[in-house]
């Protein structure tokens, strides 16, 4: 049992000790204490190195002292003749005597006491890696800021793991670099690049100083690189001992820096970057690579262009070139694609036209496009004949690769209008007589189709409803028939800038510039019941003379109906403007003089009571084209009138052709260009 103090006496003390004796005492004090052993009497046969008789003090495997001879105290106030202080809690005392003694020796008297040891200072090996704190019977270790105490309660380390680097280029250094790195730490860094890049580590010799290896060549502190199943290192010493450029052949690299308790140096700093994987230069017949390079690497893109007369076919699409990308696995994308003799492929279809299926689509073949006659014609010429060219395109001698454009034939009704009986005083009509006729249901009115995307009408029709619902292709506007006709959806309404917008439109006396355009969301498909009317030419041929006949059509008021359900039409002569001025306005909203008459208006009617009326507004006053008798053009638009059944006023469209063309051009879609 450990004790705090004790006494040790040589055999027979204070009498002479016997010969040939060997006696040992095992002293043990409680853990955390040292032993103070002191002798108050010493009288042992003296010999060289105490070879004959001796008292030996042993701590572990170390001999703390070997005593013989006589000693006396140097201090008159202390009886101690010899003393030992050991920082351990165990001590062995061995007394030996040989076979003879020339004199009578009385031996020794010794005492031991347990003393506090300062573990922090009393040992060569410091017990704590950083801060040591002594207390009676023990000690404890503590750490500086940002360090933590390991489970052994002695060593401090830093938490330097967990960083993941994903950038294609970067720099990593040991903690505190270039100040000394922390001891007793394990730092792990991960580099994780996207596939297709290998991590390349670059170091400078002078950027590396890590505690050197021991005599056996083992690194005490070490830097190790692990890439998959490959390891680089461990490395240590002053100046980097490994290759200054490490190609890992992997997109993932783990860096492990392990330090022990001693010998902190400045550490290390490295740079890394992602090196793209290389792809081989391949031989592809009948083609040229662009750009041409000696070496291709990951993410490099080449354009492989076929020679003239060759093409690359992917699925059903032909092209003269394709792109290939160096992939992360070191292989080219699109490697299956090859340059073959040109096949122009199935010719592209065109709106409102067709192309006969060709016998062959290879280089030199000929095809012919036609438009859906008689409703469409080929606008941009070229005759519609195309041949398969070396670049894989169908080419026309005039248009080149540009496709023919089939545009609606204007002003040609499928059936001519014939007056069957005496609108007001008009006749029943069929929509095939007036395929350009558009029906507006709110307000109840008309308009004229002038091409696939545009409807011409009177400004007063749309000024109160900028999102009108329109229909084409039906003789009857009976609801069930309208459901089967084509409804047109407006995209935007353009009212002539010269049309005066009034606070109270009911009191209008000025109908000058009564013209508007409605742009449609979708193109109208032409046919026997739907096709546009032509616009007037700008030449003097299109100047109207008194007596010139024009056709009007609409679903407006008749003698019998407020609103006609079936289309009505009438043939009217152009009249001098004064004839319209002379008619008394049936319901004047102002003095007769207030009503405005301008050269932008055509006066027509007056014959047999035939006239347009309420509900006909916006419809075309159609006149035979002076240069092509098979066609009609919109000379006027139903605008206003003093009295139904007399003369009516029509907007003179010729005066607005420039505005119409400009508005349509500025608001066209790519499909229409």
């Amino acid at each position: 049992e450990p004790t705090m103090y004790g006494e040790i006496l040589s055999p027979n003390y204070p009498q002479a000790y016997p010969s040939e004796v060997e006696k040992s005492w095992d002293i043990e004090v409680p853990e955390g204490y040292g032993i103070h052993l002191y002798f108050t009497h010493l009288d042992i046969e003296l010999s060289e190195n105490c070879a004959y008789d001796s008292v030996q003090i042993i701590s572990g495997d170390t001999e703390e002292g070997r005593l013989c001879g006589q000693r006396s105290s140097n201090n008159p106030h202390s009886p101690i003749v010899e003393e030992f202080q050991v920082p351990y809690n165990k001590l062995q005392v061995i007394f030996k005597s040989d076979f003879s003694n020339e004199e009578r020796f009385t031996g020794f008297a010794a005492y031991y006491v347990a003393t506090d040891i300062n573990e922090c200072t009393d040992f060569v090996d410091v017990p704590c890696s950083h801060f040591c704190n002594n207390f009676i019977g023990g000690y404890f270790c503590s750490c500086p800021p940002e360090y933590f105490l390991h489970d052994d309660m002695k060593n401090c380390g830093v938490n330097c793991s967990g960083d993941v680097f994903t950038a294609l280029i970067g720099e990593i250094a040991s903690p505190n670099y270039p100040k000394p790195y922390p001891e007793n730490s394990r730092c792990e860094y991960q580099i994780r690049l996207e596939k297709g890049f290998q991590v390349v580590v670059t170091l400078r010799r002078e950027d590396f100083d890590v505690e050197a290896a021991d005599s056996a060549g083992n690194c005490l502190d070490s830097l190790v690189f692990v890439a998959g199943d490959r390891q680089f290192g461990p490395y240590c010493g002053h100046g980097f001992p490994g290759p200054l450029n490490i190609e890992t052949k992997s997109n993932a690299l783990d860096i492990i820096f392990q330090t022990d308790l001693t010998g902190q140096k400045k550490g290390w700093k490295l740079r890394y970057h992602g090196d793209p994987m290389p792809c081989p230069k391949e031989d592809t017949p009948n083609s040229v690579w662009e750009p041409a390079k000696a070496k291709y690497v990951f993410r490099d893109v080449v354009q492989i262009t076929c020679l003239d007369g060759f093409e690359v076919v992917e699925g059903r699409v032909g092209a003269t070139s394709f792109y290939s990308t160096c992939q992360s696995n070191g292989k080219w994308s699109n490697s299956k694609l090859k340059c073959q003799p040109v096949d122009c492929g199935i010719p592209e279809s065109i709106e409102n036209g067709k192309v006969e299926d060709p016998e062959s689509t290879l280089f030199g073949s000929v095809i012919r496009y036609t438009c859906e006659e008689p409703y469409y014609y080929m606008e941009n010429g070229g005759g519609g004949e195309y041949h398969c060219a070396g670049n894989g395109s169908w080419v026309n001698e005039v248009l080149g690769p540009e496709l023919p454009k089939c545009v609606p034939v204007c002003g040609v009704p499928r059936e001519p209008f014939e007056e069957k009986q005496r609108i007001i005083g008009g006749s029943d009509a069929d929509i095939k007589n007036f395929p350009w006729q558009v029906f507006f249901d709110n307000p109840w009115a008309g308009g004229a189709l002038i091409n696939e995307y545009w409807v011409l009408t009177a400004a007063h029709v749309v000024e109160g409803n900028r999102e009108p619902t329109m229909y084409v292709g039906s003789t009857s506007v009976q609801t069930s028939r309208l459901a089967k006709s084509k409804m047109l959806t407006p995209e935007h309404v353009f009212i002539h800038p010269g049309w005066k917008l009034l606070e109270v439109p009911e009191g209008r006396t000025n109908f000058d510039n009564d013209i508007a355009l409605v742009r449609l969301k979708d193109p109208v498909k032409m046919g026997p019941t739907v096709s546009p009317i032509c616009l007037p030419g700008t030449s003097s041929d299109y100047n109207l003379m008194d007596g010139d006949l024009g056709l009007i059509s609409g679903w407006g008021r008749t003698e019998k109906r407020d609103r006609a359900v079936r289309l009505k039409a009438a043939r009217l002569p152009v009249a001098p403007l004064r004839k319209c001025k002379e008619v008394k306005v049936e319901k004047p909203t102002a003095d007769a003089e207030a009503y405005v008459f301008t050269p932008n208006m055509i006066c027509a009617g007056g014959e047999k009571g035939m006239d347009s009326c309420k509900g006909d507004s916006g419809g075309a006053f159609a006149v035979q084209d002076p240069n092509d008798k098979t066609k009609f053009y919109a000379a006027g638009l139903v605008s206003w009138g003093p009295q139904c059944g007399t003369y009516g006023l029509y907007t003179r469209v010729k005066n607005y052709v420039d505005w119409i063309m400009k508005t349509m051009q500025e608001n066209s879609t790519p499909r229409e260009d």
């Epitope: 029943d428 249901d441 709110n442 307000p443 109840w444 109160g464 619902t469 009857s476 506007v477 009976q478 609801t479 069930s480 439109p505 009911e506 679903w555 008021r557 019998k560 109906r561 407020d562 609103r563 006609a564 359900v565 079936r566 049936e586 319901k587 309420k614 009295q643 139904c644």
Partner: antibody
Framework: EVKLEQSGAELVRPGASVKLSCTAS????????IHWVKQRPEQGLEWIGR????????KYAPKFQDKATMTADTSSNTACLQLNSLTSEDTAVYYC????????????WGQGTLVSVSA | FALMTQSTDYLAVSLGQRATISCKAS??????????MNWYQQKPGQPPKLLIY???NLESGIPTRFSGSGFGTDFTLNIHPVEEEDAATYYC?????????FGGGPKLEIK
């Protein structure tokens, strides 16, 4: 939104006249036609006639030719029905109605005006 | 002028059953291939409400349980299945020629 707002109820002496109004909102009356319909208490509907506010063109049912006069003022977007020489037979609710986008029916009606003829 | 006759003044139909209301014109109300016959529903204190126009066209917003048929002089309004809210007076009206005329308007009661 299309709306027809009619004037308030009228209590009139026999032999007198009364003028009822029908004010439109959400559209211009000159683009439509205004019809007037009579309904006597617990009785059916009778068509009085119609007016085209654009030119005051009117059509009356023969029965109301001398009883009713229809007018329209496009500047105030209002139509009127005047009833004269009133008798107890004229006690009824009078409605105005329009075509809207139809061509011979009434999707839109006023709320009606009650005319009571009593001594 | 065209006289409109609705044969009954009163009609009682069980909930969920079919109500058939007929209307006969004294002369054809057809013109240009269209029948100028319309149907209205009226509830006490309210103006009439358009249900069917041009003989068979359902006005927007009207439930599909209402349907109209006929041409010339004979026309029918069908309601199937009848619901509680359908209790009202139903008028036919011709608009083919002046003066426009209405039928007497039978009252529909839901049993």
């Amino acid at each position: 939104e299309v709306k027809l707002e009619q004037s308030g109820a009228e209590l009139v002496r026999p032999g007198a006249s009364v003028k009822l109004s029908c004010t439109a909102s959400g559209f211009n009356i000159k683009d439509d036609y205004i019809h007037w319909v009579k309904q006597r208490p617990e009785q059916g509907l009778e068509w009085i006639g119609r007016i085209d506010p654009a030119d005051d063109h009117t059509k009356y049912a023969p029965k109301f030719q001398d009883k009713a006069t229809m007018t329209a003022d496009t500047s105030s977007n209002t139509a009127c029905l005047q009833l004269n020489s009133l008798t107890s037979e004229d006690t009824a609710v009078y409605y105005c109605a329009i075509y809207g986008s139809g061509w011979a029916w009434f999707p839109y009606w006023g709320q009606g005006t009650l005319v009571s003829v009593s001594a | 002028f065209a006289l409109m006759t609705q044969s009954t003044d009163y009609l009682a139909v069980s909930l969920g059953q079919r109500a058939t209301i007929s209307c006969k014109a004294s002369q054809s109300v057809d013109y240009d291939g269209d029948s100028y016959m319309n149907w209205y529903q009226q509830k006490p204190g309210q103006p009439p409400k358009l249900l069917i126009y041009a003989a068979s066209n359902l006005e927007s917003g009207i439930p599909t349980r209402f349907s109209g048929s006929g041409f010339g002089t004979d026309f029918t309004l069908n309601i199937h299945p009848v619901e509680e809210e359908d209790a009202a007076t139903y008028y036919c009206q011709q608009s083919n020629e002046d003066p426009w005329t209405f039928g007497g308007g039978p009252k529909l009661e839901i049993k």
